[in-house]
């Protein structure tokens, strides 16, 4: 009888230990949840406030109509310039109209003066045709003014208010372009 009581007491004690463990785990879990909740709320608030204050273009980008432009502060060859733009979720500048060309050249004059800036234009080695990087042809008024004498691949760049061509392996600044965010307000 005594043995039976002592076994029951041990079982009860074991149950109590298990419950204490469970309670400890629950408390720990609750604390972890609260911390995560705090982090999530902070992150959400952060996201919401940045979304609320968000301009159509990222910091250091210039807006014109539906586009955002980034004028680089470093030199690179054409292909590296393209890679740098893609990392920003953009592509090298694709000039669609005379109005856009005027905006770009006007902005460049204010920012940096007369330097060379790669754009997303390259010449097909076989056909000699100029194409934007998405495969479309530039409008007749937006063809590079001079044909480069380079035997290497030839790419387009902007200087002052002209579109020119050069060996793609030369070092220049570059301009990236992405779509501006539409305001949902």
């Amino acid at each position: 009888k005594l043995l039976q009581v002592s076994t029951i007491a041990m079982q009860q004690q074991e149950k109590l230990i298990q419950q204490e463990r469970a309670l400890l785990n629950f408390t720990e879990w609750k604390r972890s949840c609260a911390l995560q909740m705090k982090y999530c709320q902070a992150f959400m608030q952060n996201s919401l406030s940045s979304a609320h204050n968000s301009s159509p273009c990222p910091n250091n980008w210039i807006q014109n109509r539906e586009s955002c432009y980034y004028v680089s502060e470093i030199w690179s060859i054409w292909h590296t310039s393209q890679e740098n733009c893609l990392k920003e979720g953009s592509t090298l500048l694709q000039i669609e109209s005379k109005e856009e060309m005027d905006f770009i050249t006007g902005s460049l004059r204010k920012i940096k003066g007369s330097y060379d800036y790669w754009v997303g234009l390259s010449q097909d080695g076989h056909s000699g045709r100029w194409l934007w990087q998405d495969g479309s042809s530039p409008s007749p008024g937006l063809l590079p003014a001079e044909r480069s004498q380079s035997a290497n691949q030839v790419c387009g760049y902007v200087k002052s208010n002209s579109l020119l061509s050069s060996n793609c392996s030369t070092w220049k600044y570059f301009i990236c372009e992405k779509y501006a965010l539409r305001s949902s307000v």
């Epitope: 992150f43 893609l86 990392k87 920003e88 979720g89 953009s90 592509t91 495969g135 372009e177 779509y179």
Partner: nanobody, 121 residues
Framework: QVQLQESGGGLVQPGGSLRLSCAAS????????MGWYRQVPGKQRELVAA???????AYADSVKGRFTISRDSAKNTVYLQMNSLKSEDTDVYYC???????????????WGQGTQVTVSS
């Protein structure tokens, strides 16, 4: 960390077509662009085609008019439709994602294992 799973490579005759797919999975905050690169022996990987999160597209000169890149944003998947294939398109094609793992981290390049495309008669 971003994992990229490629599929669709294989052997095809000149003039034929192939469609490559690449699905991104894992934990990441944002993917700015996805695309396809090919490894030219003795050279760096070179861009074949890329598409940004805003839908802008860039192609290599050699594939313009023949290859088409597209994406399914909901599935984080990018496709490369390769038409009018030539023997010079034979290469290992690597999927690439330019992604940020967290909202604080910088954008890095993530690569797939590569899929072989062989154009031969």
């Amino acid at each position: 960390q971003v994992q990229l799973q490629e599929s669709g490579g294989g052997l095809v005759q000149p003039g034929g077509s192939l469609r490559l797919s690449c699905a991104a999975s894992g934990r990441f905050f944002r993917v700015n662009a996805m695309g396809w690169y090919r490894q030219v022996p003795g050279k760096q990987r070179e861009l074949v085609a890329a598409i940004t999160n805003g839908g802008q597209i860039a192609y290599a000169d050699s594939v313009k008019g023949r290859f088409t890149i597209s994406r399914d944003s909901a599935k984080n998947t990018v496709y490369l439709q390769m038409n009018s294939l030539k023997s010079e398109d034979t290469d290992v094609y690597y999927c690439n994602a330019k992604a940020a793992a967290t909202h604080l981290s910088t954008v890095a390049d993530y690569w797939g294992q590569g899929t072989q495309v062989t154009v031969s008669s």
